[in-house]
């Protein structure tokens, strides 16, 4: 069998949801000594980067300026050490947002409920779309999908304090082109006194894994390189 290097890790810097005309940055973390990285888009070569010096850098950033629907889709990356290529990374879905219109998000019976109540979110967008998406702040990977002509509903079932947080919805024109986000709706779930005081609220900062952990090795950073190599082996 043909020998290959371990697959790299692909990430979106800050977020995979990029407003149109803004820049997306994708990171491909491979290995120290990699002489070339390639970014592939929907199976075709998109961009190439050759780190300098290769032995000091464990990954690269690919910049995608002027985001639009032609650049939204599935990305992956590979790298090369000498003549040996790596396996392909996992796929990363890059989404363009702020297309067309802004939906309206509402919640029934209201934004303040008690634990155990049934809650339904409604996302409405009058322009032609059939797919709607609901996201919770700080949990942007957990996208709920629902379908409807101008409005979709998202039944949450009996809620707990874990459902507390800020929600937004999008209309989707295809899997990778989304509308402007709705205004946020903050759901407040109250439980009994003990539960309420202990229940943590979700972070409102972007997802912690949406960061690029690329390192530049210096003469004093051999231990960092070793740690990185060990960490990658653990991830595998």
């Amino acid at each position: 069998p043909k020998q290959t290097l371990p697959k790299p890790i692909i990430r979106a810097e800050s977020t995979y949801m990029v407003p149109k005309e803004k820049q997306a940055t994708l990171c491909c973390q491979g290995s120290y000594g990699a002489v070339e990285y390639q970014l592939h888009f929907e199976g075709s070569l998109f961009a190439v980067e050759r780190p300098k010096p290769p032995e000091r850098i464990n990954g690269v950033k690919f910049h995608i300026p002027d985001m639009n629907s032609r650049k939204a889709g599935r990305y992956s990356c590979i790298y090369r050490v000498g003549e040996l290529w790596s396996e392909r990374s996992d796929l990363l879905d890059l989404v363009v947002t702020e297309m067309y219109d802004t939906p309206t998000l509402s919640v029934h019976p209201g934004p303040e409920v008690t634990s155990g109540e049934k809650v339904t979110f409604y996302c409405r967008l009058d322009t032609a779309t059939s797919m709607f998406l609901l996201l919770k702040e700080g949990r942007s990977r957990d996208v709920q999908r629902s379908y409807g002509k101008v409005q979709a509903e998202f039944p949450m079932g009996p809620v707990t304090t874990a459902h507390r947080g800020s929600y937004r919805c999008f209309g989707s024109y295809n899997n990778y082109a989304w509308s402007f986000p709705s205004e946020p709706v903050k759901l407040l779930v109250t439980g009994d006194i003990e539960n309420t005081s202990l229940a943590p609220t979700d972070p409102t900062f972007p997802d912690s894994w949406d960061t690029c952990l690329l390192t530049r090795e210096t003469g004093l950073q051999k231990d960092l390189a070793l740690w990185d190599h060990t960490a990658q082996n653990l991830l595998r």
């Epitope: 070569l45 998109f46 961009a47 980067e49 690269v60 910049h63 995608i64 300026p65 650049k71």
Partner: nanobody, 126 residues
């Protein structure tokens, strides 16, 4: 706003050479990644060669060793030196730019480019 104007196209015999130029307006040229694409009659536009801000280059397999891409930031001009031309090189050649860009990315996919020239025709025939 970036404007790109190609020149240098024409008719040449097989085995001959041509140098295409692409003049860019604006002060963003040095920070742009650039590329050449071509479109033959009845075919899709295809990648030819690209160059990063720091002069790293990448070529399509079909032109490797025959074509050379280069840039002159002082003149705001991109070049494509074409030699050992073949009949299958006949096409309209387009210059394209990615603006702005950062780092040393070389862009190969046409979707990456946000500015395009009008094209210059290269015809290779005996």
């Amino acid at each position: 706003e970036v404007q790109l104007v190609e020149s240098g196209g024409g008719e040449v015999q097989p085995g001959g050479s041509l140098r295409l130029s692409c003049a860019a307006s604006g002060r963003t040229f040095a920070s742009a990644a650039m590329g050449w694409f071509r479109q033959a009659p009845g075919k899709e536009r295809e990648f030819v060669a690209a160059i990063s801000r720091s002069d790293d280059t990448y070529y399509a397999e079909s032109v490797k060793g025959r074509f050379t891409i280069s840039r002159d930031n002082a003149k705001n001009t991109l070049y494509l030196q074409m030699s050992s031309l073949r009949a299958e090189d006949t096409a309209v050649y387009y210059c394209a730019a990615v603006v702005p860009t950062y780092g040393n990315n070389i862009y190969v996919h046409s979707a990456a480019y946000n500015y395009w020239g009008q094209g210059t025709l290269v015809t290779v025939k005996p």
